[in-house]
Interface confidence: medium
């Protein structure tokens, strides 16, 4: 007999979402299903069995659900197992740009770009651009093994010149979570210098 999971191997979910993992068999009329995490922590979900299909539902998903979930199907004396890695993220808001004061040519000003409620923040990269010019790029690699929503900021101090007035500041935040375009992994804020 065969075992299949939906999704096949990886589920990327935003914190607060409802997640359903499905395990099904072919070539076995009455399988016995069981679910566990790879490190045997609590499932934190509800299992529903119907014929040749078993579904594990976790609602809402949070840090405690970030595991590899293993579905085991037993058919008579034969056992098959398949895993689905559940990864969670949070990237709900566009960045915000704040200036330390009014813009004056020749007077240093600090630009702060903040991204709130991010997870996992070790995969966050923030770029601050003035027009087409990249002023600063920053990653947040430290303390990655911390399960929390955090605000991450980038700061740049520069001295504006007359030509800067009318230019735009762009804060672009990218959360490197998926190669596919299934989630909004890039967010940006724009502020005109005036």
């Amino acid at each position: 007999f065969k075992i299949e999971t939906t999704p096949e191997s990886r589920y990327l979910a935003q914190i607060g979402d409802s997640v359903s993992l499905t395990c099904s068999t072919t070539g076995c009329e009455s399988p016995f299903f069981s679910w566990r995490t790879q490190i045997d922590s609590p499932l934190n979900g509800k299992v529903t069995n119907e014929g040749t299909t078993s579904t594990l539902t976790m609602n809402p998903v949070s840090f405690g659900n970030e595991h590899s979930y293993l579905c085991t199907a037993t058919c008579e004396s034969r056992k098959l197992e398949k895993g689905i890695q559940v990864e969670i993220y949070s990237f709900p808001k566009d960045p915000e740009i704040h200036l330390s004061g009014p813009l004056e040519a020749g007077k240093p000003i600090t630009v702060k770009c903040s991204v709130a409620d991010v997870y996992p923040f070790d995969r966050l990269e923030i770029d601050l651009l003035k027009g087409d010019h990249l002023m600063k790029s920053q990653e947040f690699l430290e303390d990655a093994d911390r399960k929390s929503l955090e605000t991450k900021s980038l700061e740049v101090t520069f001295t504006p010149v007359i030509e800067d007035i009318g230019k735009v500041l762009v804060c672009r935040a990218k959360l490197h979570i998926d190669e596919m375009d299934s989630v909004p992994t890039v967010r940006q804020a724009v502020k005109e210098l005036q």
Epitope: E125, L134, D145, H176, E179
Partner: antibody, heavy 121, light 110 residues
Framework: QMQLVESGGGLVQPGGSLRLSCAAS????????VSWVRQAPGKGLEWVSR????????YYADSVKGRFTISRDNSKSTLYLQMNSLRAEDTAVYYC??????????????WGQGTLVTVSS | QLVLTQPPSVSAAPGQKVTISCSGS????????VSWYQHLPGTAPKLLIY???KRPSGIPDRFSGSKSGTSATLGIAGLQTGDDADYYC???????????FGTGAKVTVL
């Protein structure tokens, strides 16, 4: 299929320079921060340098700071390591390594075959 | 930058279980994810464990990882002759802004 192929190694005199390349294929190169890792003869693994996906952030081991420069060309899916003021202790097999996740400082699940750099007079 | 300490060598008979420790500090193991690698001479290192305790696909469940405070442990159960290799822990160090590997442990299957 995912592949990393290093090149550019060879014999160089102390004080000399060398540029290593790592050609990537089979994945979206620009999405990953990538690293150089080396192993000197009879020694353990030593992380050398890392560059973010955009190329905007770079990191170096203290032992190479000021002498080595990491860079990337995402249009060519290629990672580089410019090595200047080379010393005998830089003799090692140099690997480029890609993390398991798209960004971050996570574990390296994909490695090249390595290129040998020998610094000797 | 050798800030992660491992025992130089560990040995056991086939079928036995061995554990390899990796000791660090709050700036590395304490607050960052730990990975474990197997390295055979002349080959590229192979990732065994990531995020403290997760196995990449294709890695048998004989290999396990755990973390407690500023230390991490790799377990290898049902030891096989093919497990004869060097094993390294690795993590990011927030103080150094650098990735750090352990000193390495040689596993010998007797």
């Amino acid at each position: 299929q995912m592949q990393l192929v290093e090149s550019g190694g060879g014999l160089v005199q102390p004080g000399g320079s060398l540029r290593l390349s790592c050609a990537a294929s089979g994945f979206t190169f620009s999405s990953y921060g990538v690293s150089w890792v080396r192993q000197a003869p009879g020694k353990g693994l030593e992380w050398v340098s890392r560059i973010s996906g955009s190329g905007g952030s770079t990191y170096y081991a203290d032992s190479v700071k000021g002498r080595f420069t990491i860079s990337r060309d995402n249009s060519k899916s290629t990672l580089y390591l410019q090595m200047n003021s080379l010393r005998a202790e830089d003799t090692a097999v140099y690997y480029c390594a890609r993390p398991i996740f798209y960004g971050g400082n996570s574990a390296f699940d994909s490695w090249g075959q390595g290129t040998l750099v020998t610094v000797s007079s | 930058q050798l800030v992660l300490t491992q025992p130089p060598s560990v040995s056991a008979a086939p079928g036995q279980k061995v554990t390899i420790s990796c000791s660090g500090s709050s700036s590395n193991i304490g607050n960052n994810f730990v990975s474990w690698y197997q390295h055979l001479p002349g080959t590229a290192p192979k990732l065994l464990i990531y995020d403290n305790n997760k196995r990449p696909s294709g890695i048998p469940d004989r290999f396990s990882g755990s973390k407690s405070g500023t230390s991490a442990t790799l377990g290898i159960a049902g030891l096989q002759t093919g497990d004869d290799a060097d094993y390294y822990c690795g993590t990011w160090d927030s103080s150094l802004s650098a990735y750090v590997f352990g000193t390495g442990a040689k596993v010998t299957v007797l």
